[in-house]
């Protein structure tokens, strides 16, 4: 039997069949004569009793309140009451993403290590008897799999397996067709062992600049998720209004580590910005690594060997 709905806060997507099952179900069968009631409260309305007459979309069966389907205006608090037993749920119905086969806020994320066993099984035990067919999509493209009742993927993970997998169950109820979507965001990572973070490029960079112009110093690193990359420039705080740290950007590498980039933007370069160290540091549990940038006036370039310059 399908387990009861124990989570007090539930988010669902509009337009899909949905049910609430109270958690004293076995007890309810023992006392058939006891009055059992379902209520809803939302905003202005306090505790309105629910019954099939309240809405053609609502059905009541023993321990279950069903929605065919659930809609945005079903958002609210729901109560089941029987004798001195009460159970409460807070239901939040969110808008369907009409431009995708799934709704972002209803995605379950899973991380799978490369070469480890990876499995996705499409099943829905509560609606099982009503389901006509089930399709599995990867990044909203249908996968051609043998079993169209419970499509399944079972394999050793490869990096190409990364993506959004959506199980879509198609079912009929009272002559209408419905579908229920469950989506997994699968991220394939290298083994979980940490790397020693590394700053990319030379440790010391002389940058040729012109006074009054702007320059962007880019600092990039390969690092672990918890490592940080930051700029240090002089003891005083960013008292120089011309110096701006841009937002750090991160993207996962195919190996499951992180490529981070942080730009220091210096506008309207003045004499005070020349021949001082702008340090970019990556800090990890294993220590720190630093690379330095020095701004040099273009006119003074001749004094420095060509190989130490960066553009």
């Amino acid at each position: 039997a399908e387990s009861c709905t124990s989570r007090p806060h539930i988010t669902v997507v509009e337009g899909e069949p949905f049910y609430l099952k109270h958690c004293s179900c076995s007890l309810a069968h023992e006392i058939e004569t006891t009055t059992k009631s379902w209520y809803k409260s939302s905003g202005s309305q306090e505790h309105v009793e629910l019954n099939p007459r309240s809405s053609s979309r609502i059905a009541l069966h023993d321990c279950v309140l069903e929605f065919w389907p659930v809609e945005l205006n079903d958002t609210g608090s729901y109560f089941f009451q029987m004798k001195n037993y009460t159970q409460k749920w807070k239901l939040n119905v969110i808008r369907r993403n009409k431009h995708s086969c799934f709704t972002e806020r209803q995605v379950t994320s899973k991380i799978v290590e490369v070469k480890k066993f990876f499995q996705i099984t499409c099943e829905n035990s509560y609606y099982q008897t009503l389901v006509n067919s089930t399709s599995l999509y990867k990044n909203c493209k249908k996968l051609l799999l043998e079993n169209n009742k419970n499509p399944t993927i079972k394999k050793n993970a490869e990096f190409e397996d990364q993506g959004y997998y959506s199980c879509v169950h198609f079912l009929h109820h009272n002559g209408k067709l419905f579908n229920i979507t469950k989506t997994f965001n699968i991220t394939i990572v290298e083994d979980r062992s940490n790397i020693v973070p590394v700053l990319l490029g030379p440790k010391l960079n002389h940058v040729a600049v012109e006074l009054g112009k702007n320059v962007r110093l880019n600092c990039s690193a390969l690092l672990n998720e918890e490592d940080v990359i930051y700029w240090m420039f002089g003891e005083e705080n960013g008292s120089d209004p011309n110096i701006h740290e841009e937002k750090e950007m991160r993207i996962m590498t195919p190996e499951g580590k992180w490529h981070a980039s942080k730009v220091l933007r210096i506008e309207n370069i003045g004499e005070s910005n020349l021949n001082v160290l702008y340090n970019c540091t990556v800090a990890s549990t294993g220590g720190t690594d630093t690379k330095s940038f020095i701004l040099v006036r273009k006119a003074d370039m001749a004094d420095i060997p060509g190989h130490v310059f960066t553009r």
């Epitope: 998720e225 991160r250 549990t285």
Partner: nanobody
Framework: EVQLVESGGDLVQPGGSLRLSCAPS????????MRWYRQAPGKQREWVAS???????NYANSVEGRFTVSRDNAKNTVYLQVNSLKPEDTAVYYC????????????????WGQGTQVTVSS
Amino acid sequence: EVQLVESGGDLVQPGGSLRLSCAPSGSIFSINAMRWYRQAPGKQREWVASIATGGNTNYANSVEGRFTVSRDNAKNTVYLQVNSLKPEDTAVYYCNALIKPSSTDRIFEEYWGQGTQVTVSS
């Protein structure tokens, strides 16, 4: 637009403790590392601690052993438990997180909170 909101800052005596919290408001798809920075008057902002999605942590030497960073992934919330506070810990504490606003984005982008003031004084 995503915003980070910090709370928990206060005036506290040396040796005292505080718990700072930070959570995003607005629609987000995924959060990567969450970090705490601080900025003392007249100083540059400095990194304090960070925590990965899986719970791995990383601390600046100046706070190691006194500060503890933790997070609740279900609530997208990060905490900083600050113990054995010293006058030199006085600063505005900023929350920072790498956030992917939607599933179509491949890049996590850095967001900052407005800061919460921690003052250590007798």
